[in-house]
């Protein structure tokens, strides 16, 4: 069902695995990190080189896009169903262009169903990427270029690019434009995690991963 189950079934090597939706036979391919922090992590987002366009539609963010071996978005529907079955933690791993790494760990993470636009719910932040959550709390509805559910007259997803849980527009967007080194500062629409690197810094790499809290 998820990478934690795959791990527990004896598959302890990083790689792409076929997962199934809860209470369904529908399948989805995901990258499983079986080494970091004890393994069993389902990767739900990865940015690393700008090879994939993240300015996608609501339907694309719903079902997922990209390549699990590289840059990709796993899909809001799968993540919503998974995280409403049991308690999950969310770990966000970040890299800047100067060789630094940081993370934010939320001890409870889930997405509402599509009915409430995959609204994000987070509790219990720890980690090195800021003492304040760069995902606005309480959580907001997900927005895309064709689904404007934010709290700004500016249409955050169109202005900042990418689908995200925008507020107005808020202190983060890990699905923003990918900017290469030396072009990554003073970018309002880049890959942003405000409480680590500030507002204009666009990150080199990001990974969002989830795992059952009782793993």
């Amino acid at each position: 069902r998820d990478c934690a189950e795959v791990f527990k079934s004896g598959h302890t090597t990083n790689g792409i695995y076929t997962l199934t939706f809860p209470n369904s036979t529908e399948e989805i391919k995901a990258y499983c990190d079986m080494e970091a922090g004890g393994g069993g992590w389902t990767i739900i987002q990865r940015r690393e080189d700008g090879s994939v366009d993240f300015q996608r539609t609501w339907k694309e963010y719903k079902v997922g896009f990209g390549n699990p071996s590289g840059e990709y978005w796993l899909g809001n529907e799968f993540v919503s169903q998974l995280t409403n079955q049991q308690r999950y933690v969310l770990k966000i791993h970040l890299k800047d262009w100067e060789g630094n790494e940081a993370y934010s760990l939320y001890e409870h993470f889930y997405l509402s169903s599509e009915e409430l636009n995959y609204r994000i719910h987070l509790k219990g932040l720890t980690g090195t990427a800021g003492k304040i959550s760069s995902i606005s709390q309480p959580g907001n509805d997900f927005s895309t270029k064709d689904g404007d559910n934010d709290k700004c007259i500016c249409k955050c997803s169109q202005m900042l690019t990418g689908g995200w849980w925008f507020d107005a527009c808020g202190p983060s967007n890990l699905n923003g434009m990918y900017y290469p080194q030396r072009q990554n500062t003073n970018k309002f629409n880049g890959i942003k995690w405000y409480y680590w690197k500030g507002s204009g810094y666009s990150l080199k790499a990001t990974t969002m991963m989830i795992r059952p809290a009782d793993f």
Partner: antibody, heavy 120, light 107 residues
Framework: QVQLVESGGDVVQPGRSLRLSCAAS????????MHWVRQAPGKGLEWVAI????????YYADSVKGRFTISRDNSKNTLYLQMNSLRVEDTAVYSC?????????????WGQGTLVTVSS | DIQMTQSPSSLSASVGDRVTITCRAS??????LAWFQQKPGKAPKSLIY???NLQSGVPSQFSGSGSGTDYTLTISSLQPEDFATYYC?????????FGQGTRLEIK
């Protein structure tokens, strides 16, 4: 400019059916969610239902669930509300409203409404 | 369901007055709040969404504020065309619900 024009309102007996229509113009209909909202005579506003831009999701108020069906025909730029098993308490002016986006749950434009009277 | 309670239910004011209408939700709604204006026999007009964002074409004498469960609509200087009934609406969760309305009359 955005225009929403409802039709189909009538006087009907309890238990009967009625279908309301909302003709939309002045915008790309297929890019927006649409709602039905009603207002009983001398009363406040009550949300009835929403349909997403592509018809993929529909949600209803408990008071109409199982009796009313919202639908749309994007090729005709028209929204519908099929009302079955009508009750006296369904008497109201029914208005269609455009969602701010595909599913934001708030509205930016409303129609004038069409009156449905359920009476024996 | 989330109950929305508006106050006052009616008020009288004069042209040029500053008027405040409040709306209280039965639970926190995280700024998912809109305001509408309705005149007799007319369709409601959307004024504000997400607590404080003015809809396109809405005059600047209207403003909104609030957080958690308590929200406010302010008309800074009443114009003759502002006399109407005002409704708040929460869209934090389904079902979408409205306040009972505030009738603003000429004194």
């Amino acid at each position: 400019q955005v225009q929403l024009v409802e039709s189909g309102g009538d006087v009907v007996q309890p238990g009967r059916s009625l279908r309301l229509s909302c003709a939309a113009s002045g915008f790309t209909f297929s890019s927006y969610g649409m709602h039905w909202v009603r207002q009983a005579p001398g009363k406040g506003l009550e949300w009835v239902a929403i349909i997403w831009y592509d018809g993929s999701n529909k949600y209803y108020a408990d008071s109409v669930k199982g009796r009313f069906t919202i639908s749309r025909d994007n090729s005709k730029n028209t929204l519908y509300l099929q009302m079955n098993s009508l009750r006296v308490e369904d008497t109201a002016v029914y208005s269609c409203a455009r969602d701010f986006s595909i599913s934001s749950r708030h509205f930016d434009y409303w129609g004038q409404g069409t009156l449905v009277t359920v009476s024996s | 369901d989330i109950q929305m309670t508006q106050s006052p239910s009616s008020l009288s004011a004069s042209v040029g007055d500053r008027v405040t209408i409040t709306c209280r939700a039965s639970q926190a709604i995280n700024n998912y709040l809109a305001w509408f204006q309705q005149k007799p026999g007319k369709a409601p007009k959307s004024l504000i969404y997400a607590t404080s964002n003015l809809q396109s074409g809405v005059p600047s004498q209207f403003s909104g504020s609030g957080s958690g469960t308590d929200y406010t609509l302010t008309i800074s200087s009443l114009q003759p065309e502002d006399f109407a009934t005002y409704y708040c609406q929460q869209y934090y969760i389904y079902p979408i619900t409205f306040g009972q309305g505030t009738r603003l009359e000429i004194k």
